[in-house]
């Protein structure tokens, strides 16, 4: 087919010769068949994954990709003579770096639907250089972990060495998918979730007096878990009095919240103090009322048949713990007037 | 790119202590588990036990008595001693980031960097 | 402790054969299995985690599956750099076990 009326695009991946890293080209049809094909669904910053718009079946894998031959060969089928380039869904996936990765690819719907469509078609100038700038040492990896519950940042490794007020506009894809109200070359994510893990791609445009370039880096984001450094803490009882009525039964819940741990051995366990003795009560196995990757929340409950003066002079005490330390809550019966 | 460097003694005496250090390069010790493995000549791996950056530990329990892994988040490294050696704990002893991925709602523990590893030989 | 189980413990192939390597766990461990490359002298290389998802930069002719007990990692078309010693690992209960290991050899 034809490709003088393909629309062209230029970018530059920049490789680093210390890390393996991957690179991705997007199918960018013009506009009406995007509709058809390969649509990025802009995603609002509170979207939840499971609520993320997915491509439709006709998005599938509805394109072809192709290779030029600089010598001016016939469009080679990529899938045929690349293996380690992987076509996923409207996605070209290079999972090794090198020079020669560099040349222009085409991307074009295999279903032709209208007479317009025989003209829609992306060609891709990549030009692919290792990276020869040595000032910048601590450029950020494009392999980034974050701490699951606690903030982090995803930052744009070909801008990473530049300081935020010096940042070209940034645009980014999150598996794909456009990022459409993030500009700078850091994300910054206020409590990471296990859906913050992806592949991220930041673009900026780079120009000269001749011409502009797309510069383009891949991330892959994992979400990580690490053991707390905090003891449990107890969410109910909070107050340290209680209010019954004599003679009838009562049930003290204690809940505590306890954070990750990999090897996880949560103590959570009621004793009386009365006096000078105390000792531990049996009351019904604890059971785990709510558990996230971030934490886990248990409750356990002492049942008295029917409360009695005497129980009115001890304290019954919720203790709890982990390996790094414990807590106590203690609550005192008090007798309910009118 | 996070790079992992063994060092300590190559030769040990039985009945003595081995002491190993792993040094992390090119990123924080921070928020990871950091494992110890070791290799003996010809044979699988076997665990020895992690340490998280906190101080956190697990061990093997075929080693646990003989066994302590420390850390230094100060200068990026952590250590293995293992006691009253034998000919048996002949070995490559490997250190290794041990990572939790939080995914599909779960989590997959995966020890995604190691070092070169370091010949350890018990012999009198 | 849970014991792992890789079979064959060696095998011979030739480059572009599709190998698989089972490992077997003595108890149910869902998806708690990883595989790791080891080629002589150097240090084992992390290959696939929660028994299916592949580590990124690692070729996709290389597959995991499995879940509970009975677990396999799949090479669909066998290239030169691929021999070596595989290891399958359990992260599920302590301690931390490894498969004795498969040998794979060229043809």
């Known amino acids: 087919f034809n490709i003088s009326g393909c629309s062209t695009k230029k970018l530059l991946w920049t490789y680093s010769t210390r890390s393996e890293e991957e690179f991705v080209l997007f199918c960018d049809l013009p506009e009406p068949q995007k509709s058809h094909f390969c649509h990025r669904n802009r995603l609002s910053p509170k979207q939840v994954p499971e609520h993320l718009p997915f491509m439709g079946s006709n998005d599938l894998s509805d394109v072809q990709w192709y290779q030029q031959p600089s010598n001016g060969d016939p469009l080679e089928d990529i899938r045929k003579s690349y293996p380690h380039i992987i076509q996923d869904k409207c996605t070209l996936h290079f999972l090794t770096p090198g020079v020669n990765n560099s040349g222009s690819y085409i991307c074009r719907p295999k279903m032709i639907k209208s007479p317009y469509d025989v003209a829609c078609c992306v060609k891709m100038i990549l030009e692919v250089k290792p990276q020869t700038n040595a000032s910048c040492e601590y450029s950020a990896s494009h392999k980034q972990d974050l701490l699951l519950g606690s903030t982090g940042s995803i930052s744009c490794p070909s801008l990473s060495c530049q300081s935020d007020a010096q940042s070209p506009a940034v645009t980014w894809y999150k598996n794909g998918k456009l990022l459409s109200v993030e500009r700078s070359n850091r994300i910054v994510v206020d409590e990471v979730y296990d859906y913050h893990q992806g592949t991220y791609v930041c673009d900026y445009t780079q120009s000269d007096t001749v011409s502009s370039w797309t510069v383009r880096a891949v991330v892959q984001v994992r979400t990580i878990v690490g053991d707390t450094k905090l003891k449990p803490d107890i969410l109910d009882p909070v107050e340290d009095t209680l209010e019954v009525e004599l003679g009838k039964p009562l049930t003290i819940s204690c809940k505590a919240r306890f954070g990750f741990e990999r090897v996880f051995n949560p103590v959570i366990k009621w004793y009386i103090k009365d006096s000078d003795l105390e000792w531990e009560v049996s009351v019904p196995e604890a059971k785990s009322i709510k558990s996230t990757l971030k934490d886990e929340i248990i409750e356990r409950n002492i049942i008295l048949e029917k409360v009695t003066q005497r129980d009115l002079r001890r304290k019954f005490v919720c203790f709890v713990q982990n390996s790094i330390g414990n807590t106590t809550q203690s609550v005192q019966l008090k007798e309910k007037r009118g | 790119q996070v790079q992992l460097q063994e060092s300590g003694p190559g030769l040990v005496k039985p009945s003595e202590t081995l002491s190993l250090t792993c040094t992390v390069s090119g990123g924080s010790i921070n928020n990871y588990y950091w494992s110890w493995i070791r290799q003996p000549p010809g044979k699988g791996l076997e665990w020895i036990g992690y340490i998280f950056y906190s101080g956190t530990t697990n061990y093997n329990p075929s080693l646990k008595s003989r066994v302590t892994i420390s850390v230094d988040t100060s200068k990026n490294q952590f250590s293995l001693k293992l006691s009253s050696v034998t000919a048996a704990d002949t070995a490559v002893y490997y250190c290794?980031?041990?990572?939790?991925?939080?995914?599909?709602?779960?989590?997959?523990?995966?020890?995604?960097?190691w070092g070169q590893g370091t010949t350890v030989t018990v012999s009198s | 402790a849970i014991q792992l189980t890789q079979s064959p413990s060696s095998l011979s192939a030739s480059v572009g054969d599709r190998v698989t390597i089972t490992c077997r766990a003595s108890?149910?461990?869902?998806?708690?299995l990883a595989w790791y490359q080891q080629k002589p002298g150097k240090a084992p290389k992390f290959l696939i985690y929660g028994a299916s998802s592949l580590e990124s930069g690692v070729p996709s002719r290389f597959s995991g599956s499995g879940s509970g007990t009975d677990f396999t990692l799949t090479i669909s078309s066998l290239q030169p750099e691929d021999f070596a010693t595989y290891y399958c690992q359990q992260f599920n209960s302590y301690p931390i076990t490894f498969g004795q290991g498969t040998r794979l050899e060229i043809k």
């Open positions: 108890q149910g461990i869902s998806s708690a």
């Open positions: 290794a980031r041990d990572v939790g991925i939080a995914a599909r709602n779960s989590y997959y523990y995966v020890m995604d960097v």
